[in-house]
Amino acid sequence: KKVVLGKKGDTVELTCTASQKKSIQFHWKNSNQIKILGNQGSFLTKGPSKLNDRADSRRSLWDQGNFPLIIKNLKIEDSDTYICEVEDQKEEVQLLVFGLTANSDTHLLQGQSLTLTLESPPGSSPSVQCRSPRGKNIQGGKTLSVSQLELQDSGTWTCTVLQNQKKVEFKIDIVVLAFQKASSIVYKKEGEQVEFSFPLAFTVEKLTGSGELWWQAERASSSKSWITFDLKNKEVSVKRVTQDPKLQMGKKLPLHLTLPQALPQYAGSGNLTLALEAKTGKLHQEVNLVVMRATQLQKNLTCEVWGPTSPKLMLSLKLENKEAKVSKREKAVWVLNPEAGMWQCLLSDSGQVLLESNIKVLPTWSTPVQP
């Protein structure tokens, strides 16, 4: 018996071929011997089966001795053995219809779990494999679960159902709701304007929710809420903002915050959370601010950084175009009795400069100038 796999909602064509290449009488029945369709001369006739309005054939093929049964908008319950009777012969075709659905919404937050459920006809024992856009596979029976979705799981998932050595493929589009970056770090000289950007990794027609930026300054004992905002159809409106610092927020996506001045007391790390309407859970992005200050007090030239720096980072002081006078894996370095000239304070990671501040040291009878 021939086995054909179908997909719920799709159309299937079951073939039936006569040895004579001409139009002769045929009819299709189900396993209960109820007639589905057949012909009377060149006319298509239909029986009293449940498929009545969804069954068809291709009259153009009858002259070639082909008498297909076409079933549209397949349902799981269409799974059955179909019998084609032609030239005193019976051709049996077993149709198995499967459906694959995501148990929840197909728009899921990063870190949430995805469950895919296979609808299958009674008596079948299919195996299923689903592949995420990043090439990861999950295999199982009627239910497949992935416990923690990543941003790169966004896109088209390809699921293959295997039954009786036959395969049928499903495509499911999954959108993982997340910020483009889990974490970012901004390096600024004292006094510079700071721009924080929080681009989303997905696009949806309507985006509504609310968000908040909590900030833990390095110098502070506890974190505080810097700003809260609403998002309505991609329009941003500020609800509440602290007086110090007075952040400004862009009115359109991507979420954009401006800190007028980078000051040591602001150095630290923040967590922006975004709660989306009709979604449980929140999107998170961590943001870090490192602030540098170079100063000269009497005979001491000092360079300091505040904020979350890795222990691998190197802080150095050097006279322009010369070797570093001092270079340490510390958050403050200094030079006593510095020579006159343009000094550079550099924060670097494996030779790559992350932040630079220049300070001009004048001969000892003058006062220093900061460019």
């Epitope: 494999q129 592949r131 990043r134 090439g135 999950i138 679960s145 992935v146 990543e150 293959t160 889990a182």
Partner: antibody, heavy 123, light 107 residues
Framework: QVQLVQSGAEVKKPGSSVKVSCKAS????????INWVRQAPGQGLEWMGT????????DYAQKFQGRVTITADESTSTAYMELSSLRSEDTAVYYC????????????????WGQGTLVTVSS | DIQMTQSPSSLSASVGDRVTITCRAS??????LNWYQQKPGKAPKLLIY???TLQSGVPSRFSGSGSGTDFTLTISSLQPEDFATYYC?????????FGQGTKVEIK
């Protein structure tokens, strides 16, 4: 016990092909992917590709695309790796390794390895 | 493809020493990071999966940490049988990639 047993060492001429087998025992062959990893003399590990035995679906590293074919025979619980158009740089130990499934993909790792098959390509 | 960079490429240590090997991914791989040990002429052996989970039967002196792009394998007190080459591997996305290896030698 759970093990992967590979075929013996091979000496091949440049331009020819080699087919290495990897027989699984002690577990359900179709429940795990089989990966192939190679190691040139004195070098590190290099991932070549993988197969899901029950579905026959494969993935290959770009470097080997078109030259490598990974297959699996459920009836004998054996995976195969065939490498064609051999050159001297393909002289290496070829390993098969089992990769498990769980709902947490974080747990995916090569927990069982074959003993390795030395393939020498020399004229 | 995701590049994995291990450091150092080799190190000399004595029995009883605390040894740390680092592995850096070219992009965030969450905690999809495995560590393997390989001895000369032998197949690699899984030590740690999912960045910090110890594989069954592996001594507790081995530990792993990290998430995102930076990972560490630590051997708290080096034993004679630990002299080997160690590899990190990302299982975040196909194609899977390995670090170049760190050879731990006797001082």
């Amino acid at each position: 016990q759970v093990q992967l047993v590979q075929s013996g060492a091979e000496v091949k001429k440049p331009g020819s092909s080699v087919k290495v087998s990897c027989k699984a025992s002690g577990y359900t062959f179709t429940s795990y992917d089989i990966n192939w990893v190679r190691q040139a003399p004195g070098q590190g590990l290099e991932w070549m590709g993988t197969i899901t035995p029950i579905f026959g679906t494969t993935d290959y590293a770009q470097k080997f695309q078109g030259r490598v074919t990974i297959t699996a025979d459920e009836s004998t619980s054996t995976a195969y790796m065939e490498l064609s158009s051999l050159r001297s740089e393909d002289t290496a130990v070829y390993y098969c390794a089992r990769e498990g499934y769980s709902s947490s993909w974080h747990d995916d790792a090569f927990d069982i390895w074959g003993q390795g098959t030395l393939v020498t390509v020399s004229s | 493809d995701i590049q994995m960079t291990q450091s150092p490429s080799s190190l000399s240590a004595s029995v009883g020493d605390r040894v740390t090997i680092t592995c850096r991914a070219s992009q965030s791989i969450s905690s999809y990071l495995n560590w393997y040990q390989q001895k000369p002429g032998k197949a690699p052996k899984l030590l740690i999966y999912a960045a910090s989970t110890l594989q069954s039967g592996v001594p507790s002196r081995f530990s792993g940490s990290g998430s995102g792009t930076d990972f560490t394998l630590t051997i708290s007190s080096l034993q004679p049988e630990d002299f080997a080459t160690y590899y990190c591997q990302q299982s975040y996305s196909i194609p899977y990639t390995f670090g170049q290896g760190t050879k731990v030698e006797i001082k």
